[in-house]
């Protein structure tokens, strides 16, 4: 007789694929409109992401440090009105899109949260998380809760609220910290909580290090649903050195846990790659015409229009990777292990019951290495084949679809594979 | 077939500079990782430089650190080596090698070699 | 000085055996770095006989062969010929001086 199935847990629509945030509009527009209406013209890229969830804003009216001018139930008017905020919604929802709605109240502001008045400002926010959810809100974002006094209390009292509501809501958090300690005590009092932080920038980006901070926190959050980025709100090539960002592409849609993007990301946008944008508002790449004040040889490979042609860019990567995530159950709630590794080098496998396995082994290194991969630390639900189909690799060159000896893999500098072998009984 | 054929060897005094230059063919250039060795008259081989398929990442020996200076045009498939304030220890055979891709960094191909001597 | 230890010689008779061993420590070899090995002909470019530890090129016959262990790697040679007789060197990446190294090179004479 076959083996029983295991029982499929419970999947919220956050655990599917990757989060996208957009902070700015019109960085994320690029044509000095952005607003909610251009917005909409944009989702069916977001489609083309395979991206499950956008987050948001803030969009709200805030003037800078002034609780009383700041109001969470309003629109600015410079991003559009609350008609066509619930365009946005009808259409993000049709293409299956949800909108998580950042409520981060100061955000124009020298302190997130305001110095003083907190009571005011957390019932500010409870009002906003009732007025959002009735208008049909998938989800919440609210960053800086380091400067957010008691935010462990405030943040369950919120996540009540969202959740009171339905369980199909998302709270996100995010915070500055990279201290494990400090974010494990904010994840404690919140089940169910989706936590962006600095934990992984926090890594001098070699394979041992990154392996050792992904343990630790899987580890230490058991069998919580984490989420995966490096920041709470800035681009991957803020914190990456360049030869990384696939590396890393990789190693975030692969994780178990969400992995969260800001704009640009799937390009590999640089935060100053427009000379006079400021840093944090990195104007998006969509074409040539992006490029008012450069015309650098070569532009085109940084753009969404010449990546999306290109079938070895970083934003291909992106799409490949994104579709995996959210179809294959390995990688959509599959066990995690790490196996043991070299100098340089982080790998670990990705399985679900009878479901295909997924191998991901990383080389962080700039010199190329014998992987040999021996599966002496796994237990046996998950051993190692001797061989695997090569899925995908983040370099040029390899023959994809072709099996690969394990024990003899050999990696290129700052490469990283994505190899599938099925379940053998 | 892979070549690599270096140019720009001689004779200059101590102080002096050099520059010597690789020429590949047979294999795109642009893919592939390429390096300095040299080879003092009898003895040693010893690894001088190395830079990455696009010419962003560099490497350098302790004993050529801000002396030397590796480039690449990968439009005219040529490696460079820069050498400034030569010194007499620096006299050797200086081959151009490639690094071989999927072997662990080996230096798969190598040039003939261009000889350079720094004497007064 | 080397960062890599070699002997300076080694010989054998025709149709024997030599190993050439190549010792480094836990920034190289040690480390988990790969082990490659040279053969360098007199009045010759060197060329790559051994890379990944033990795996060969095509056209490097099959009584060259390589290992590894621990900090540790050896060249082994049977069958020798009198066209082997040449300078070999082993080579690794050192994570402490970030760069390449080589070890001395072994002489080796067929009798």
């Known amino acids: 007789r076959a083996p029983r199935c295991r029982d499929l847990p419970v999947q919220k629509w956050w655990h599917t694929g990757a989060l996208y945030r957009i902070g700015d509009l019109q960085g994320f527009q690029g044509n000095g409109a952005g607003n909610l209406a251009g917005l909409k013209g944009h989702l069916d890229y977001l489609s083309s992401l395979k991206v499950k969830g956008l987050v948001l804003g803030p969009i709200h009216k805030n003037q800078k440090d002034d609780v009383a001018g700041t109001d969470l139930l309003q629109i600015d008017p410079n991003f559009g009105s609350k008609e066509d905020f619930a365009s946005l919604l009808q259409s993000a929802k049709k293409k299956s899109i949800r909108i998580i709605l950042d409520l981060t109240p100061n955000y124009q502001g020298e302190n997130s949260w305001f110095s003083t008045q907190v009571d005011t400002v957390a019932t500010k926010v409870k009002d906003a998380l009732e007025f959002w959810l009735q208008a049909g809100v998938d989800g919440f974002q609210v960053r800086d809760i380091e400067n957010l006094k008691d935010a462990s209390s405030f943040l369950a009292e919120w996540q009540n609220i969202t959740k009171g509501f339905s369980e199909d809501r998302l709270l996100i958090a995010g915070t500055n910290s990279s201290d494990l300690q400090q974010i494990l005590s904010l994840l404690e009092s919140n089940k169910d909580l989706l936590l962006t932080s600095s934990y992984l920038s926090n890594s001098s980006f070699t394979g041992e290090h990154t392996k050792s901070l992904v343990t630790q926190y899987l580890n230490a959050t058991g069998n919580r649903w984490c989420s995966w980025s490096l920041s709470q709100a800035g681009l991957l090539t803020s914190f990456l050195p360049a030869q990384l960002l696939r590396l890393y592409q990789l190693m975030l849609f692969t994780l178990p846990g969400t992995p969260v993007f800001s704009y640009g990301d799937e390009i590999g946008l640089e935060a100053a790659a427009v000379p006079g944008q400021p840093v944090e508002a990195p104007v998006m790449l969509w074409d040539e015409s992006s490029f008012p004040f450069i015309s650098a040889a070569g532009s085109a490979n940084m753009t969404v229009k010449g990546q999306s042609e290109d079938p070895g860019s970083l934003l291909s990567l992106f799409r490949r990777l994104s579709d995996q995530r959210s179809k294959e159950r390995s990688l959509l709630h599959g066990d995690f292990h790490a196996l043991s590794s070299g100098p340089g080098f982080f790998s670990y496998i990705r399985h679900w019951d009878q479901n295909e396995r997924f191998l991901v082994v990383l080389n962080f290194g700039d010199v190329g290495l014998s992987a040999g991969l021996q599966a002496s630390d796994l237990p046996a639900s998950a051993s190692l084949p001797a061989k695997a189909d090569l899925l995908l690799s983040t370099q040029p060159g390899r023959d994809e679809g072709s099996p690969l000896e394990l024990e003899r893999l050999k990696l290129e500098p700052h490469e990283g594979l994505l190899l599938r072998f099925p379940y053998v009984a | 077939e892979v070549q690599l054929v270096e140019s720009g060897g001689g004779l200059v005094q101590p102080g002096g500079s050099l520059r010597l230059s690789c020429v590949a063919s047979g294999f795109t250039f642009s893919s592939y990782w390429m390096h300095w060795v040299r080879q003092a008259p009898g003895k040693g081989l010893v690894w001088v430089s190395r830079i990455n398929s696009d010419g962003s990442i560099i490497r350098y020996a302790d004993s050529v650190k801000g002396r030397f200076t590796i480039s690449r045009d990968n439009a005219k498939n040529t490696l460079y080596l820069q050498m400034n304030s030569l010194r007499a220890e620096d006299t050797a055979v200086y081959y151009c090698v490639r690094e071989g891709r999927y072997t662990g960094s080996s230096l798969d191909y190598w040039g003939q070699g261009a000889l350079v001597t720094v004497s007064s | 000085q080397s960062v890599l230890t070699q002997p300076p010689s080694v010989s054998g008779a025709p149709g024997q055996r030599v190993a050439i061993s190549c010792t480094g420590n836990?920034?190289?070899?040690?480390?988990?770095?790969?082990v490659h090995w040279y053969q360098q002909l007199p009045g010759t470019a060197p060329q790559l006989l051994i890379y990944g530890n033990s795996d060969r090129p095509s056209g490097v016959p099959d009584r060259f062969s390589g290992s590894k262990s621990g900090t540790s790697a050896s060249l082994a040679i049977t069958g020798l010929q009198a066209e082997d007789e040449a300078a070999y060197y082993c080579?690794?990446?050192?994570?402490?001086?970030?760069?390449?190294?080589f070890g001395g090179g072994t002489k080796l004479t067929v009798l």
């Open positions: 836990n920034s190289n070899i040690g480390a988990g770095y790969d």
């Open positions: 080579q690794s990446y050192d994570s402490s001086l970030t760069g390449w190294v």
